[in-house]
Interface confidence: low
Amino acid sequence: VEVQVSEDPVVALVDTDATLRCSFSPEPGFSLAQLNLIWQLTDTKQLVHSFTEGRDQGSAYSNRTALFPDLLVQGNASLRLQRVRVTDEGSYTCFVSIQDFDSAAVSLQVAAPYSKPSMTLEPNKDLRPGNMVTITCSSYQGYPEAEVFWKDGQGVPLTGNVTTSQMANERGLFDVHSVLRVVLGANGTYSCLVRNPVLQQDAHGSVTITGQPLTFPPEA
């Protein structure tokens, strides 16, 4: 028996369901009584789900997994993983035994989009050209780690005096805080872009500093 899986990682959003595809080619006359199917974590061999002795043995993974029982006899051994968590990320092995056996691994990449950045300014009043100001761009609840880019009003990248920190919360999602220190000109716009490298999702935030009080562009 030959097992086939997707070579590309499966990308799943946190709290959505994911399907880890696995298939085999049953011989003529194949019955489910012959099938021994095991899904396990590749690194640790922890059991995730199994089908043995002609029946679905159920989830060994917090009751969040399921097979496609009506499709098994056709050779579809895919696994449904419900309510995906960051901690589900990794490699899963599909093991199929009928008379001989084969196995293959499929990677699950978990992702979560970053929120629209919030911008803060320090100090935020009595600003004059030549003042040093600190602009903080904060974006929340994303995964995996973000890439952060700063630009000025002309679209010129700002790379000096930027400090970015990323902290994982209890769910493993990252909160991103990027700090830009700049010397004010007469006026100017500063924008940050928080990019999720897996989703290719960009979240934008910007702040405009003029001779008048600080203004934020309206929410899109």
Epitope: D43, T44, Q46, S59, A60, T87, D88, G172
Partner: antibody
Framework: EVKLQESGPGLVKPSQSLSLTCTVT?????????WNWIRQFPGNILEWMGY???????SYNPSLQSRISVTRDTSKNQFFLQLNSVTTEDTATYYC????????????WGAGTTVTVSS | DIVLTQSPSSLAMTVGQKVTMSCKSS????????????LAWYQQKPGQSPKLLVY???TRESGVPDRFIGSGSGTDFTLTISSVQAEDLADYFC?????????FGGGTKLEIK
């Protein structure tokens, strides 16, 4: 706030069994994560002993496989370590520890309990 | 089993100095599927439990000061304290979280002069 608290006898005789309890508060051990036992020998060497996952499956260090059992009581939100046929070499501080899912790094540690094996 | 070797076994530094300590693995800890290195660093102050500082070789745990910097890939890893403080007096351990059995290095003891 998550807390892990080890308890059990501080003195065990050679050839007997060592039994420890970890009581978890602030988080259900059936919700997520792996719940581990790690010990630290005199001289500060750390050894991972094994875990029981939130789904109830266990994995052990092969060096202890024949002597170790990690079980749990979900109604009390506790998990347990049993180590059989102890020798003086099992004298150590024993920690119960939570690891983030399958990532196997250790984010929450109990305070530890010292067990001396001596006759 | 994966063996982790830490060096030096001890070092004494003065407040404000930069500290580097090494952890070498007997096997590659880089997971090619996600390009992450499965190595963690812990700090253990006298009389306390170990505390997670860094995982995946360079990701700082929440609340850890940014003077603690993890780096490296494959088999060679480094923990740097950019400007050591008196409260950093502790033992530091590396741990591979690549595969079971999970293993730790022998530790580096940091003393403050």
């Amino acid at each position: 706030e998550v807390k892990l608290q080890e308890s059990g006898p501080g003195l065990v005789k050679p050839s007997q069994s060592l039994s420890l309890t970890c009581t978890v508060t602030g988080y259900s051990i059936t919700s997520d994560y792996a719940w581990n036992w790690i010990r630290q020998f005199p001289g500060n060497i750390l050894e991972w002993m094994g875990y029981i996952s939130y789904s109830g499956s266990a994995s052990y260090n092969p060096s202890l496989q024949s002597r170790i059992s990690v079980t749990r009581d979900t109604s009390k939100n506790q998990f347990f370590l049993q180590l059989n046929s102890v020798t003086t070499e099992d004298t150590a501080t024993y920690y119960c520890v939570r690891s983030l899912g399958r990532r196997w790094y250790f984010g929450f540690w109990g305070a530890g309990t010292t067990v001396t094996v001596s006759s | 089993d994966i063996v982790l070797t830490q060096s030096p076994s001890s070092l004494a530094m003065t407040v404000g100095q930069k500290v580097t300590m090494s952890c070498k693995s007997s096997q590659n800890l880089l997971n090619s599927s996600n390009q992450k290195n499965y190595l963690a660093w812990y700090q253990q102050k006298p009389g306390q439990s170990p505390k997670l500082l860094v995982y995946f070789a360079s990701t700082r745990e929440s609340g850890v000061p940014d003077r603690f910097i993890g780096s490296g890939s494959g088999t060679d890893f480094t923990l740097t304290i950019s400007s050591v403080q008196a409260e950093d007096l502790a033992d530091y351990f590396c741990q591979q979280h690549y595969s079971t059995p999970l293993t730790f290095g022998g530790g580096t003891k940091l003393e403050i002069k």
